[in-house]
């Protein structure tokens, strides 16, 4: 994915990213020989990040939207080297991979969470869905196990559906060779969809509309 | 005001059917998961059945499973239970009440209606 | 199923004195899931502890919750004439929840 091309452009930085890009220049300032504790540090942005004002933010911002027209500029210009893609060709048709019982859940009691708590960021969501969860009964959590394995069910047997259709350009090659890069595509397949799965509860998140709790 | 208002209960045969609601306001009805609970004259409380949020999951005491229908229209802020195969032992005051997480303390009833009477006698 | 047994069955006391409920579990139950609740006659019962120890909202503080793993204890500080009722805790250990019968309390 480009990870080894020196000419590929620098990924966009979010507002987020360069407060604590200032923050750590800021630190190493005040006390260049001290090594820093990540989470610590981490934890002391975030709770920094909460408390700007959306003036104090505004300068960060202006920083994020000047990076992305930045990358943007670049990437037009890009060649990815031969044989790699800008990102991995993903067939809009493939089957996708079967949500999590614990996805399952969290799209449930999502919004509740947002309800009861409307201030709260996309990973403090998550912090408390999953203290949700781990506070969840066996038996309670049975439903969601069962929905999710059914989706398992149907996903494999559409997956196999649609690999038996096969790809055009695949059956020019080798058989053997198909077979032994069978299972590191299958690996690679749900590594990818897992990042799909996370991609989607952000955009959920960020989507969703805050609502109080008791009117 | 946060509230439940049940209705429907009253007299019925055995064997008969009756379908209970529960009008609930002051509250964001669609974040919580919600509950039927009983209680039969002079006895204790007994959990009936319970739905998820969206509705998409339910779940019902032994007693009362293959009988009773739990459901939930969150556009009318309103909460069911279909009773059929009404046995005399079925017989109690019917109560809707809230399921409210308090994070990592757990979870309780917080808010309650006030009941409707369901009597199953010939 | 975790069964909730409640002693004593009734509980006779006076206006001021120190009322002591007990909830034994059959089997352990988490802290976080046993709850305390409040009925008097003609209505619904009200929550009065949760999480084996937080007063819910509005709960006077002479009520409060202690106990952990099978034996759970309400006590009520300084009995108020409006605190004669029956008093039920409840656990959540599966998708069980169940209730102890209750203990009354009433006016000797």
């Known amino acids: 994915m480009g990870k080894g091309d020196p000419k590929k452009p620098r990924g966009k930085m979010s507002s987020y990213a360069f407060f604590v890009q200032t923050c750590r220049e800021e630190h190493k300032k005040k006390h260049p020989d001290a090594s820093v504790n990540f989470s610590e540090f981490s934890k002391k942005c975030s709770e920094r990040w909460k408390t700007m004002s959306a003036k104090e933010k505004g300068k960060f911002e202006d920083m994020a939207k000047a990076d992305k027209a930045r990358y943007e500029r670049e990437m037009k210009t890009y060649i990815p080297p031969k044989g790699e893609t800008k990102k991995k060709f993903k067939d809009p048709n493939a089957p996708k991979r079967p949500p999590s019982a614990f996805f399952l859940f969290c799209s449930e009691y999502r919004p509740k969470i947002k309800g009861e708590h409307p201030g709260l960021s996309i990973g403090d969501v998550a912090k408390k869905l999953g203290e949700m969860w781990n506070n969840t009964a066996a038996d309670d959590k049975q439903p969601y196990e069962k929905k999710a394995a059914k989706l398992k069910e149907k996903y494999e047997k559409d997956i196999a559906a649609y690999r038996a259709k096969g790809k055009p350009d695949a059956a020019k090659k080798g058989v053997v060779k198909a077979e032994k890069s069978k299972k590191k595509k299958e690996e690679e397949e749900d590594e990818e969809d897992e990042e799909d799965e996370e991609e989607e509860e952000d955009e959920e998140d960020e989507d969703e509309e805050e609502d109080d709790d008791d009117e | 005001e946060v509230q439940l208002l049940e209705s429907g209960g009253g007299l019925v045969q055995p064997g008969g059917s009756l379908r209970l609601s529960c009008a609930a306001s002051?509250?964001?009805?669609?974040?919580?998961?919600m509950f039927w609970v009983r209680q039969a004259p002079g006895k204790g409380l007994e959990w009936v059945s319970r739905?998820?949020?969206?509705?998409?999951?339910?779940y019902y005491a032994d007693s009362v499973k293959g009988r009773f229908t739990i459901s939930r229209d969150n556009s009318k802020n309103t909460l069911y239970l279909q009773m059929n195969s009404l046995r005399a032992e079925d017989t109690a005051v019917y109560y809707c009440a809230r399921l409210r997480y308090f994070d990592s303390r757990g979870y309780a009833f917080d808010i309650w209606g006030q009941g409707t009477m369901v009597t199953v006698s010939s | 199923d975790i069964q909730m047994t409640q002693s004593p069955g009734t509980l006779s006391l006076s206006p001021g004195e120190r009322a002591t409920l007990s909830c034994r579990a059959s089997?352990?139950?988490?802290?976080?899931?046993l709850a305390w609740y409040q009925q008097k006659p003609g209505q619904a019962p009200r929550l009065l502890i949760y999480?084996?120890?937080t007063r819910a909202t509005g709960i006077p503080d002479r009520f409060s919750g202690s106990g952990s793993g099978t034996d759970f204890t309400l006590t009520i500080s300084r009995l108020e004439p409006e605190d004669f009722a029956v008093y039920y805790c409840q656990q959540y250990g599966t998708s069980r929840w169940t209730f102890g019968q209750g203990t009354k309390v009433e006016i000797k």
């Open positions: 002051g509250f964001t009805f669609s974040s919580y998961d």
């Open positions: 089997q352990s139950v988490r802290s976080s899931y």
């Open positions: 999480g084996a120890s």
């Open positions: 739905i998820s949020p969206s509705g998409g999951y339910t």
